[in-house]
């Protein structure tokens, strides 16, 4: 058993049929010595008396808010949560496996630039009685500070018969140099509590590996005389690290119709303009990627050919 | 300890091409190592990230773009002195600070070159003959060093009398390649910045 926060405790249980469970001793936070009784949740049934209560925690029915009273007055609470371990593996029931970039990916993180600010998100099908707490640091043995905000519900989607909820959090490394060469990864830890179930999820990464620039901005087309070619130009996204001559991007320019199966014109360039062939009912799209360290491509920025 | 804006004329910077080749060569070599050593811990997640130039050179700080010198997190206190007579400078106006940056890059390359050559000598003794360093990568390191053209004492190649541990050597190769790729990215950024200035 360990303390998650004040008056909230996590009991780690090996979860298998007829498991013996864990013996837990609760102590009432009071100078009083006698006349103390214990109850669980909203029940008025007295579970025991005295300053300490010993319980055998085996299942979710044994978890919950234990309260010690004296003469009708509440003295203190202890909330017990369960953390299940099945076949030596901690349970991951609360969050959905996003399977990208690999299996068992519950947290996904992205950074728009090298400033040390990043966003992580996760998915769940649970809609109520759910809380998240996020901590982060650079390295684990001698951790350096990363400050994370509160996790918020950022999107709701319908997936077949199920509703899916996306939560996200923004974090900022306390003293980040965009030009630095990272040797210690960022660690992100998410505590998830659903009713009386506790789970924790972690992710470890270098900012350089989670870079995904915003799409290029200000796409403009200029038809070339006596030709089917058009010159398309664009600018670096505002959120990208500066100076751009140091933090350079490379671009992919594509002309395609509405369907992905349609024929296309595609060209890669380090410049902020390119010449392509425009077709009726097609769109010109441009996306960006760090020129020197190949992490993710940005989303497409698009303009119609016409 | 930062790069000034008054740098060589655009397009007159002979090291840009070499640095691009360097990044390409080390990236290819790293990819080859990951594939060949698939049963060794050779991915970014699996290895320890070590920097053999730590406390010996200060390339990131010495080559910091002017725009980032206002960022206190970028200004490390490490001080290292370097020789300052490079040929990539292509202009008499080039400042002492830029020479410091380029000589720091030269020192990095020299250290990695020695490590890689020592390692290759060990890998050539491996009866499995599983992996060797790409000669192209070693050649590209040499080309960039020649383009930088700094005079400095030659570092003797480390020779080892004991029987090499090939498993450890291959793990060290992965560690070295990952670190060198990150440094090659920095070098490419620096050259691009200098070329544009």
């Amino acid at each position: 058993i360990w303390e998650l926060k004040k008056d909230v405790y996590v009991v780690e249980l090996d979860w298998y049929p007829d498991a013996p469970g864990e013996m837990v001793v609760l102590t009432c936070d009071t100078p009083e010595e006698d006349g103390i009784t214990w109850t669980l949740d909203q029940s008025s049934e007295v579970l025991g008396s005295g300053k300490t209560l010993t319980i055998q925690v085996k299942e979710f029915g044994d978890a919950g808010q234990y309260t010690c009273h004296k003469g009708g007055e509440v003295l203190s609470h202890s909330l017990l949560l369960l953390h299940k371990k099945e076949d030596g593996i901690w349970s991951t029931d609360i969050l959905k496996d996003q399977k990208e970039p690999k299996n068992k990916t519950f947290l996904r993180c992205e950074a728009k630039n090298y400033s040390g600010r990043f966003t992580c998100w996760w998915l769940t099908t649970i809609s109520t009685d759910l809380t998240f707490s996020v901590k982060s640091s650079r390295g684990s043995s001698d951790p350096q500070g990363v400050t994370c905000g509160a996790a918020t519900l950022s999107a709701e989607r319908v997936r077949g018969d199920n509703k899916e909820y996306e939560y996200s959090v923004e974090c900022q490394e306390d003293s980040a140099c965009p030009a630095a060469e990272e040797s210690l990864p960022i660690e992100v830890m998410v505590d998830a509590v659903h009713k009386l179930k506790y789970e924790n999820y972690t992710s470890s990464f270098f900012i350089r590996d989670i870079i995904k620039p915003d799409p290029p901005k200000n796409l403009q087309l200029k038809p070339l005389k006596n030709s089917r070619q058009v010159e398309v130009s664009w600018e670096y996204p505002d959120t990208w690290s500066t100076p751009h001559s140091y933090f350079s991007l490379t671009f992919c320019v594509q002309v395609q119709g509405k369907s992905k199966r349609e024929k296309k014109d595609r060209v890669f360039t380090d410049k902020t303009s390119a010449t392509v062939i425009c077709r009726k009912n097609a769109s010109i799209s441009v996306r960006a990627q760090d020129r020197y360290y190949s992490s993710s491509w940005s989303e497409w920025a698009s303009v119609p050919c016409s | 300890r930062n790069l000034p804006v008054a740098t060589p004329d655009p397009g007159m910077f002979p090291c840009l091409h070499h640095s691009q080749n360097l990044l390409r060569a080390v990236s290819n070599m790293l990819q080859k190592a990951r594939q060949t050593l698939e049963f060794y811990p050779c991915t970014s997640e699996e290895i320890d990230h070590e920097d053999i130039t730590k406390d010996k050179t200060s390339t990131v700080e010495a080559c910091l773009p002017l725009e980032l010198t206002k960022n206190e997190s970028c200004l490390n206190s490490r001080e290292t002195s370097f020789i300052t007579n490079g040929s990539c400078l292509a202009s008499r106006k080039t400042s002492f600070m830029m020479a410091l940056c380029l000589s720091s890059i030269y020192e990095d390359l020299k250290m990695y070159q020695v490590e890689f050559k020592t390692m290759n000598a060990k890998l050539l003794m491996d009866p499995k003959r599983q992996i060797f360093l790409d000669q192209n990568m070693l050649a590209v390191i040499d080309e960039l060093m020649q383009a930088l053209n700094f005079n400095s004492e030659t570092v003797p190649q480390k020779s080892s009398l004991e029987e090499p541990d090939f498993y450890k050597t291959k793990i060290k190769l992965c560690i070295l390649l990952h670190a060198f790729r990150i440094r090659a990215v920095t070098i490419d950024r620096v050259m691009s910045y200098l070329n544009a200035s």
Epitope: R261, E262, D265, F268, I277 | -
Partner: antibody, heavy 118, light 107 residues
Framework: QVQLVQSGAEVKKPGSSVKVSCKAS????????LHWVRQAPGQGLEWMGW????????EYAPKFQGRVTITADESTSTAYMELSSLRSEDTAVYMC???????????WGQGTLVTVSS | DIVMTQSPLSLPVTPGEPASISCRAS??????LHWYQQKPGQQPRLLIA???QSISGVPSRFSGSGSGTDFTLTISSLQPEDFATYYC?????????FGQGTKVEIK
């Protein structure tokens, strides 16, 4: 399976014209760009131009501009390349090639040898 | 026009050994570079697109690298069926242009 089948070999006199055909099978004809590339005996490859069969748009290499005409007939899934004012240096194997991507070629015809000789 | 220069023009290789062919562009073409194999009397076959993207059905011993002006096609271990002429082609701008070809021959 996508296939491009070209017309047979031709012998032409200098100053005359030649029209080579390229019939596509497998896949929808208008879903691909169609190019013509030539190869002189023992020489390398030389791009001549492309057509978008969907709308008839064409683009030619400056070297052949005014001398080459590429057309397409959607009803027969056939593309044509006509080269006029032939000279002996036009002796080559003419190949059609296609792709959903405009700028490179993933399926090629077997080639048509055009010999220009007096 | 962008001029593509291949080297060497002839490459004698022992079967089972690796081979590398170089292609240089007269100006920067990013990764707009494709590789083809052509055997005598046959049409070309696409091997690699956009400098390094493998093509379905092409053996994994063929790989490409490079960007800007310098590109390489590598065959990790030459098989008897790999003896052929190899061409690079730039798609950065029209007109599309090819290298003059590299003939890989049995040593």
């Amino acid at each position: 399976q996508v296939q491009l089948v070209q017309s047979g070999a031709e012998v032409k006199k200098p100053g005359s014209s030649v029209k080579v055909s390229c019939k596509a099978s497998g896949g929808t004809f208008s879903d691909y760009y169609l190019h013509w590339v030539r190869q002189a005996p023992g020489q390398g490859l030389e791009w001549m131009g492309w057509i978008d069969p969907e709308n008839g748009d064409t683009e030619y290499a400056p070297k052949f501009q005014g001398r080459v005409t590429i057309t397409a007939d959607e009803s027969t899934s056939t593309a044509y390349m006509e080269l006029s004012s032939l000279r002996s240096e036009d002796t080559a194997v003419y190949m059609c090639a296609r792709n959903k991507e405009l700028r490179y070629f993933d399926v090629w015809g077997q080639g048509t040898l055009v010999t220009v000789s007096s | 026009d962008i001029v593509m220069t291949q080297s060497p023009l002839s490459l004698p290789v022992t079967p089972g050994e690796p081979a590398s062919i170089s292609c240089r562009a007269s100006q920067s073409i990013s990764i707009n570079l494709h590789w083809y194999q052509q055997k005598p009397g046959q049409q070309p076959r696409l091997l690699i697109a956009f400098a390094s993207q493998s093509i379905s059905g092409v053996p994994s011993r063929f790989s490409g690298s490079g960007s800007g002006t310098d590109f390489t096609l590598t065959i990790s271990s030459l098989q008897p069926e790999d003896f052929a002429t190899y061409y690079c082609q730039q798609s950065n701008s029209f007109p599309l242009t090819f290298g003059q070809g590299t003939k890989v021959e049995i040593k």
